[in-house]
Amino acid sequence: QPDAINAPVTCCYNFTNRKISVQRLASYRRITSSKCPKEAVIFKTIVAKEICADPKQKWVQDSMDHLDKQTQTPKT
C-alpha cells in the first residue's frame, strides 16, 4: 500500500511481489519525488485498490505501456 507522508507526497516502501493481470488495472501514476526512498509505480485497480510496483520489472513496464495505449485510444 502507498503511504502518504506529509501529504500530498505519496511514497512506496515495498513493492508487490505478485504480477497483476492487466485486465484488473484501471490506471497508474509515477512516483518520482526525491522525498521518497525509491521511484515507483502506483497501479489503481478496477476496484479502486492502489498497489505499489517496481518500475524496473518488465511486467510493470508492459502494463504501463498497455494502459497508456488504452488511455489514448478513443473508446467506441
Partner: antibody, heavy 117, light 107 residues
C-alpha cells in the same frame, strides 16, 4: 536532497579514451537507472545510454554502441561513462542523470570533455 | 529512433506574454514526453513529464498538453527568469530523443 557530482574537465587527444564519474548522494543508485546525456557546444541534448546499477544491465543509443561503456559501483554510489576512440566531434559537456522512467529528474553539473590534437 | 521536431527554434517575447512551444514526434509516443528548461552553463531542469505532471517547485504558469504525436509547452505569462532554452524529450522508447530546442529571448 539528491545530488549528482561529476568529475572535472578533461582534455584528450583524438583516438584516446575518457572516463567520467558521477557520484550520487541522497539516493540509493540501485533503486534507479543512471543515464548519460551529452551536449556539443551550442547544440542540443543527446542521450547516450543508461545502466541499472542493481544488475549492471545497460542500454545504449546504437550510435554509441561499441564505443561507450557505462558501469556503476553501488558500494560508492558512483556511475561511470567511458568513451573510446575519441574524435573532435566528441567535444561536449557530458551529463549524468537519474530516472527509472526514461526522463531525468536530477542531473549532474556536467563534465566538459575537449578532444584536440 | 523516434525523431522529435521542435518549433520554433527561437522566439522573442516580452515579460507577461503567453508563449507556446510545439514538439512533433515522428510516431505516437502516448503522452510519454518531458519538457526541460536550460540556462547557459547549467544542466537542464525538468519541468513537466507525462500527460500533465508538473515537477515539484515548477510554477503553475508552465503547462503541457497534447497527445499522439503533437505536444505543446505553454508559459501563460512569461517572467524574467523564464528566458532560457526549452527542450522536449520522448521517453516512450529507447533511444530516448530530444527536440532541437527553443531559445526564448527578450524582445
Amino acid at each position: 536532497q539528491v545530488q549528482l557530482v561529476q568529475s572535472g574537465a578533461e582534455v584528450k587527444k583524438p583516438g584516446s579514451s575518457v572516463k567520467v564519474s558521477c557520484k550520487a548522494s541522497g539516493l540509493t543508485i540501485s533503486h534507479t537507472y543512471m543515464h548519460w546525456v551529452r551536449q556539443a557546444p551550442g547544440q542540443g541534448l543527446e542521450w547516450m545510454g543508461r545502466i541499472d546499477p542493481d544488475n549492471h544491465n545497460t542500454k545504449f543509443d546504437p550510435k554509441f554502441q561499441g564505443r561507450v561503456t557505462i558501469t556503476a559501483d553501488t558500494s560508492t554510489s558512483t556511475a561511470y561513462m567511458e568513451l573510446s576512440s575519441l574524435r573532435s566531434e566528441d567535444t561536449a559537456v557530458y551529463y549524468c542523470a537519474r530516472g527509472v522512467f526514461g526522463f531525468f529528474e536530477h542531473w549532474g553539473q556536467g563534465t566538459t570533455v575537449t578532444v584536440s590534437s | 529512433d523516434i525523431q522529435m521536431t521542435q518549433s520554433p527554434s527561437s522566439l522573442s517575447a516580452s515579460v507577461g506574454d503567453r508563449v507556446t512551444i510545439t514538439c512533433k514526434a515522428f510516431e505516437d509516443i502516448y503522452n510519454r514526453r518531458a519538457w526541460y528548461q536550460q540556462k547557459p552553463g547549467k544542466a537542464p531542469k525538468l519541468l513537466i513529464h507525462g500527460a500533465t505532471s508538473l515537477e515539484h517547485g515548477v510554477p503553475s504558469r508552465f503547462s503541457g498538453s497534447g497527445s499522439g504525436t503533437d505536444y505543446t509547452l505553454t508559459i501563460s505569462s512569461l517572467q524574467p527568469e523564464d528566458f532560457a532554452t526549452y527542450y522536449c524529450q520522448q521517453f516512450w522508447s529507447a533511444p530516448y530523443t530530444f527536440g532541437g530546442g527553443t531559445k526564448v529571448e527578450i524582445k
